[in-house]
Interface confidence: low
């Protein structure tokens, strides 16, 4: 799996999970989230050569097409596969609210 | 939806469905598929600005992060959303076989 266990331990130019810390105020301009201040969102990036963690049959077709036709603009892209939620604390007036924001943390990647 | 009905009728730089015809022999080097000779595979391409057909909350976060930090390498990517199968005819010896290859045709796209 193209997850932290693999990607953070290997120098990998191909599609892999990359570390990314997001500070809500600084990076997004969000002031409404009280806790946490930020979180390890991570992101996916890297090349998608033929058969490199292909998501679907179409991805395989596209990467093979791109290999044979390298000048073509059609090529697969490295995107998130497994995501996890993030629990946040915010206030409505003086009342603290806890909410789970789904799909906030990328845990692994794929070529799609 | 970023499908043919919208994307093929509009000039759209942002993430959208793009037409792509794949010839099995010419483009993939596949000689084993007897029918069809090729098919409209389509593909997804284009920019993913903030809130443009975002797949997940993480995609929204990433595109907003990319807006505020345009030099960052972390940005969402335009990929396939809905896919359809393709029915093919091939031969094993002299015996014709019909098979449905899943996820071969892209019908719509998303930013992920």
């Amino acid at each position: 799996a193209l997850d932290a266990a693999y990607c953070f331990r290997n120098v990998q130019d191909n599609c892999c999970l990359r570390p990314l810390y997001i500070d809500f105020k600084r990076d997004l301009g969000w002031k409404w989230i009280h806790e946490p201040k930020g979180y390890n969102a991570n992101f996916c990036a890297g090349a998608c050569p033929y058969l490199w963690s292909s998501d679907t049959q179409h991805t395989k077709v596209l990467s093979l097409y791109n290999t044979i036709n390298p000048e073509a603009s059609a090529s697969p892209c490295c995107v998130s596969q497994d995501l996890e939620p993030l629990t946040i604390l915010y206030y409505i007036g003086n009342t603290p609210k806890i909410e789970q924001l789904s799909n906030m943390i990328v845990k692994s990647c794929k070529c799609s | 939806a970023l499908d043919a009905a919208y994307c093929f009728r509009n000039v759209q730089d942002n993430c959208c469905l793009r037409p792509l015809y794949i010839d099995f022999k010419r483009d993939l080097g596949w000689k084993w598929i007897h029918e069809p000779k090729g098919y409209n595979a389509n593909f997804c391409a284009g920019a993913c600005p903030y809130l443009w057909s975002s797949d997940t909350q993480h995609t929204k976060v990433l595109s907003l992060y990319n807006t505020i930090n345009p030099e960052a390498s972390a940005s969402p990517c335009c990929v396939s959303q809905d896919l359809e199968p393709l029915t093919i005819l091939y031969y094993i010896g002299n015996t014709p076989k019909i098979e449905q290859l899943s996820n071969m045709i892209v019908k719509s796209c998303k930013c992920s």
Epitope: Y21, D23, H34, E35, P36, K37, G38, Y39, N40, L86, T87, I88, L89, N94, T95, P96, I98, I105 | -
Partner: antibody, heavy 118, light 108 residues
Framework: QVQLVQSGAEVKKPGESLKISCKGS????????VAWVRQMPGKGLEWMGW????????RYSPSFQGQVTISADKSISTAYLQWSSLKASDTAMYYC???????????WGQGTLVTVSS | SYELTQPLSVSVALGQTARITCSGD??????AHWYQQKPGQAPVLVIY???DRPSGIPERFSGSNSGNTATLTISRAQAGDEADYYC??????????FGGGTKLTVLG
């Protein structure tokens, strides 16, 4: 003024059940979370979990999930910590605390000492 | 699971400055809070949100937090400052965690 008053010390035998309490006063009880913190003899503080008395939402530390139950009765502004079957290793001081945000407890109860011994 | 690491003990001469550290992965990205606990008493909040003091806590107590380390600084240390000090924060799943505690001894 804000106060959290806990129930008195308890001496129990292994296998017995127990429910200790924490009564809040001087503030709107349903507006703030109540957390429970364990301190074993001579050891440090351990967060056990919290409850939102307004909604009765709870969250437990993985170490305490399934070992204890946190509840609240907002009509009497009281939070509870209970065990269905005590073990000797549950011997500790238990504190409740008003929680403003993660890790941020501004008022604490005086503590309830629980001793489990055969 | 997320861990916060503190020194077991710190000694400071009367009237001097004591610094107690708390380290954890990317701790600077989260809020860190500090508690003082004297023998036989409940903990007391002395610093919250990295560097803010609750009312009633002397200005001698201050906090900072960056990188992987939060620091509690007690200037002009007094005998009454002798206590156990705990840092507290949380991980990305918002599971709260306390440091192991540091025993502060004021010498002289």
């Amino acid at each position: 003024q804000v106060q959290l008053v806990q129930s008195g010390a308890e001496v129990k035998k292994p296998g017995e059940s127990l429910k200790i309490s924490c009564k809040g006063s001087g503030y709107s009880f349903t507006r703030y979370y109540v957390a429970w913190v364990r301190q074993m003899p001579g050891k440090g503080l351990e967060w056990m979990g919290w409850i939102d008395p307004g909604q009765s939402n709870t969250r437990y530390s993985p170490s305490f999930q399934g070992q204890v139950t946190i509840s609240a009765d907002k009509s009497i502004s009281t939070a509870y910590l209970q065990w269905s079957s005590l073990k000797a290793s549950d011997t500790a001081m238990y504190y409740c605390a008003r929680m403003l945000a993660w890790g941020w407890f501004d008022y604490w109860g005086q503590g309830t000492l629980v001793t489990v011994s055969s | 699971s997320y861990e916060l690491t503190q020194p077991l003990s710190v000694s400071v001469a009367l009237g001097q400055t004591a610094r107690i550290t708390c380290s954890g992965d990317n701790l600077g990205g989260y809020y860190a809070h500090w508690y003082q606990q004297k023998p036989g008493q409940a903990p007391v909040l002395v610093i919250y949100d990295k560097s803010d003091r609750p009312s009633g806590i002397p200005e001698r107590f201050s906090g900072s937090n960056s990188g992987n380390t939060a620091t509690l600084t007690i200037s002009r240390a007094q005998a009454g400052d002798e206590a156990d000090y705990y840092c507290a924060s949380y991980d990305s799943s918002l599971m709260m965690v306390f440091g192991g505690g540091t025993k502060l001894t004021v010498l002289g």
